[in-house]
Amino acid sequence: QSNCTCPTNKMTVCDTNGPGGVCQCRAMGSQVLVDCSTLTSKCLLLKARMSARKSGRSLVMPSEHAILDNDGLYDPECDDKGRFKARQCNQTSVCWCVNSVGVRRTDKGDQSLRCDEVVRTHHILIELRHRPTDRAFNHSDLDSELRRLFQERYKLHPSFLSAVHYEEPTIQIELRQNASQKGLRDVDIADAAYYFERDIKGESLFMGRRGLDVQVRGEPLHVERTLIYYLDEKPPQFSMKRLTAG
């Protein structure tokens, strides 16, 4: 049926076979029912993506414990709520532990590796480099535009965007959300950051044609490069101390 689609997630298959002929949408690759009035969890989106494939200074220094997603795409295991399972393994029985954004936080091991819990990522630092402009953006205007973006497009509660830093041409957006702060209907910072990342790359997960339209006082913001750092509530457990470069 033509009008049965999921506006917040392209990576779904929808039908009206549910009770009362209501439109229901399931994530590709997992068949989990998704709520199309809000963001889909990053785990289900990564799984769908893999299934589709088969088919003085103002800037923040990332903490020594911050980790970058260097491993890239993998086919994750999600729980029944669509969240990442603590232990992830590949087809060759290599396993590792992940945080709540699905990024590896331990060395890789074999199937005997134990991951006791999904450690929550409570701080995400999104670092953007913008294309050169005639003059630098006004920091206050940039701050309010990005806050507006995260609140409106990703429905992230304003309190979870803790700061916007700017030192031309680098912009840093800090998202902070402890488990205790996240209410039942609150969007997770992990999901907001992932949708934003895909939007910035021109790979929007939203169904409509309307893409990102970020402009500061009429001047478009064009992003050239993106780095995302993830800081967990507990330090990562790599065998050597490192801050990975992406």
Partner: antibody
Framework: AVTLDESGGGLQTPGGGLSLVCKAS????????MFWVRQAPGKGLEWVGV????????NYAPAVKGRATISRDNGQSTLRLQLNNLRAEDTGTYYC???????????????????WGHGTEVIVSS | ALALTQPSSVSANPGETVKITCSGG???YGWYQQKSPGSAPVTVI????KRPSNIPSRFSGSLSGSTNTLIITGVQAEDEAVYFC????????????FGAGTTLTVL
């Protein structure tokens, strides 16, 4: 105060074209999506189309798609609707409206309209 | 295309609480009051629950699932009008849509 002032209506001939203009004042025009909504005599409201802040994105109702063009001049704070190949069913009052949620994934929603113009009447008749 | 469903009419006595529902869209609902055909609509609620500063506090909106409700607490004679809900059609095209309108009669 937010003011939206439409003009350009009147008697039009079938097959012809019309150009409606909406002059905005009392707010930073560049910060808002803008809509056109119409109402046929004795009927309900009908969403016609939307344009985003920069003018880089437009979307139209199926009834006017291919015949309508919405444009804006942010310097002059004006919104325009060009509607070609006019039909009798295009008769009605045309309203210019402001959209309050420019970044929303569902920003084309008629539910984000927070201000309306007084309307301009269009009659398509031979 | 998707249709927003709202009752065609409701009636109430002055001082009563009126609830008008609108369903069938996603988030991003609004409510528009039109006192006479051809007169400019007035936004009473937009973006699910936001009320313009010039609208009395007796008007409120609430969203539950895919149903939005306009609530008028302590309805007054001057609230008699047609109320249109606006929303978002998720069918290909992803356009704005309006419900057919609800006529509120204050007895």
């Amino acid at each position: 105060a937010v003011t939206l002032d439409e003009s350009g209506g009147g008697l039009q001939t079938p097959g012809g074209g019309l150009s409606l203009v909406c002059k905005a004042s009392g707010f930073d025009f560049i910060d808002y999506d803008m809509f056109w909504v119409r109402q046929a005599p004795g009927k309900g409201l009908e969403w016609v189309g939307v344009i985003n802040r920069s003018g880089s994105y437009t979307n139209y109702a199926p009834a006017v798609k291919g015949r309508a063009t919405i444009s804006r001049d942010n310097g002059q704070s004006t919104l325009r609707l060009q509607l070609n190949n006019l039909r009798a069913e295009d008769t009605g009052t045309y309203y210019c409206a402001r959209g309050a949620c420019t970044h929303c994934w569902d920003a084309d929603s008629a539910g984000y309209i927070d201000a309306w113009g007084h309307g301009t009447e269009v009659i398509v008749s031979s | 295309a998707l249709a927003l469903t709202q009752p065609s009419s409701v009636s109430a006595n002055p001082g009563e609480t009126v609830k008008i529902t609108c369903s069938g869209g996603y988030s991003g609902y609004g409510w528009y009051q039109q006192k006479s055909p051809g007169s400019a609509p007035v936004t009473v609620i937009y973006w699910n629950d936001k009320r313009p500063s010039n609208i009395p506090s007796r008007f409120s909106g609430s969203l539950s699932g895919s149903t939005n409700t306009l609530i008028i607490t302590g309805v007054q004679a001057e609230d008699e009008a047609v109320y249109f809900c606006g929303g978002y059609d998720s069918s290909p095209g992803y356009v704005g849509i309006f419900g057919a309108g609800t006529t509120l009669t204050v007895l």
